[in-house]
Amino acid sequence: FNISGCSTKKLLWTYSTRSEEEFVLFCDLPEPQKSHFCHRNRLSPKQVPEHLPFMGSNDLSDVQWYQQPSNGDPLEDIRKSYPHIIQDKCTLHFLTPGVNNSGSYICRPKMIKSPYDVACCVKMILEVKPQTNASCEYSASHKQDLLLGSTGSISCPSLSCQSDAQSPAVTWYKNGKLLSVERSNRIVVDEVYDYHQGTYVCDYTQSDTVSSWTVRAVVQVRTIVGDTKLKPDILDPVEDTLEVELGKPLTISCKARFGFERVFNPVIKWYIKDSDLEWEVSVPEAKSIKSTLKDEIIERNIILEKVTQRDLRRKFVCFVQNSIGNTTQSVQLKEKRG
């Protein structure tokens, strides 16, 4: 299709080489009458409308994204060629930063319902640059935490070093929806609830003598509880002896509850104590079996191919640890009688 009629938007993504961050493009289809797609939209390309993330369709996945190759080749369907770019409804998610993401991205409705709809498309020219030696050492992170029940704020990473007075008008989105009342470089939250969690996008306009473009940053906001003050506790095994049958395979499970920690490095290991020797056993990876805001339950199993006489004279020790401390639980095997 002819993309010359598409409205154009220029975006800049300045990414930090220190941290993992994501980026999003919204399919900002012009919808002055809030109609379905761009039906009867007679705007010329020069009359750029107020862009809003497209919310007019009942089926929000009814858009198609393309990338325009720089060498003039035909448009490429994003889904087929770019595994690190994911389409979610009307939004394009870039999972990894890098200058190779620079380029022109076009979105348009999948269903063309009238001749007027042909021009219903948006071309986004994305420039991606690594952050130069930051003039601001402590720029806000692309991953921010809000403590439940307290006050907090969400800062726009690209503007976090500017005072509120200097800051340009900022447009904020949460999970793709415009937050119309927020215009500052910081969103202040009086009391944090779990619904404040989500993907926030902040946009502001930067201009030079030639052109203007939108500077965009994405912030993943997590609502958290305070760090635990407790060492982990072992939920299983509870008993320190376990009846077993000689010659049969055996799996002993260790389940431990770890309280929330912002920097979470749980340790769960099995040791064998054989008289006065003790060594760590190579066992399958630990797995999380339940995760809530407050805590996480992690399980790790030790597997014996068959229980031997010697195993009855050993102790199997589960060791768990977080930043506060550690806990152990040992299990002695006992032969089943009769």
Partner: antibody
């Protein structure tokens, strides 16, 4: 540490009980407490063990029947020997597997 | 019953030299590595050198090196010193029963 006691000069056919006294560690932690002997000028020979936390015992094939290992308190293990012969003459060591040995006690069987 | 066969015996080497002692088990030791090496001098109890086939016991010089798996094990003593003159024993721990001692290897340092 470990210390053996009870070594003596006895006549063939006699019985004798050796005692191993432990200090500085707890039997409840679960150790193999074993007896090993060494005849003069010969190598080490394993006799039998008791697992200190649950009392399980096991023996070398040749020692079954004549030798009995028991835990008599939270710090002592004994070796009862019956029908002794001159071939049983040896230094008897108490061994906490794998690292701790007593100095040994000498048993001499002679008429 | 398990049998541990040690070879050779005796073995002699000059100060600064290297000796290698082999230990073969009639069946695999527990976990394929539950084997220890001891040094014994006359009138003394044995002293632990190596456990779990290759782990050096605390305070033992790194000149002593253990290796092996399953049924075949080796103790190597390099940069031999006069004080290394002693009898060396391998000891295996087994899944089905208890322990077995090798017959011992006397190391003579010239």
């Amino acid at each position: 540490s470990l210390e053996e006691s009870g070594g003596d000069l006895v006549k063939p056919g006699a019985s004798l009980t050796l005692t191993c006294t432990a200090s500085g560690f707890s039997f409840s932690s679960g150790y193999d407490m074993c007896w090993v002997r060494q005849a003069p000028g010969k190598g080490l020979e394993w006799i039998g063990c008791i697992y200190s936390s649950n009392g399980l015992t096991w023996y070398a094939t040749w020692a079954k029947g004549r030798f009995t290992v028991s835990k008599t308190s939270s710090t002592t293990v004994t070796l009862q020997m019956t029908s002794l012969t001159a071939a049983d003459t040896a230094s008897y060591f108490c061994w906490r597997v794998w690292s701790l040995w007593g100095p040994g006690t000498l048993v001499t069987v002679s008429s | 019953a398990q049998v541990l066969t040690q070879t050779p015996s005796p073995v002699s080497a000059a100060v600064g030299g290297t000796v290698t002692i082999n230990c073969q088990s009639s069946q695999s030791v527990a976990d394929n590595n539950l084997l220890a090496w001891y040094q014994q001098k006359p009138g003394q109890p044995p002293k632990l050198l190596i456990y779990k086939a290759s782990t050096l016991a605390s305070g033992v010089p790194s000149r002593f090196k253990g290796s092996g798996y399953g049924t075949q094990f080796t103790l190597t003593i390099s940069d031999l010193e006069c004080d290394d003159a002693a009898t060396y024993y391998c000891v295996g721990g087994y899944s089905t029963s208890g322990y077995a001692f090798g017959g011992g290897t006397e190391v003579v340092v010239k």
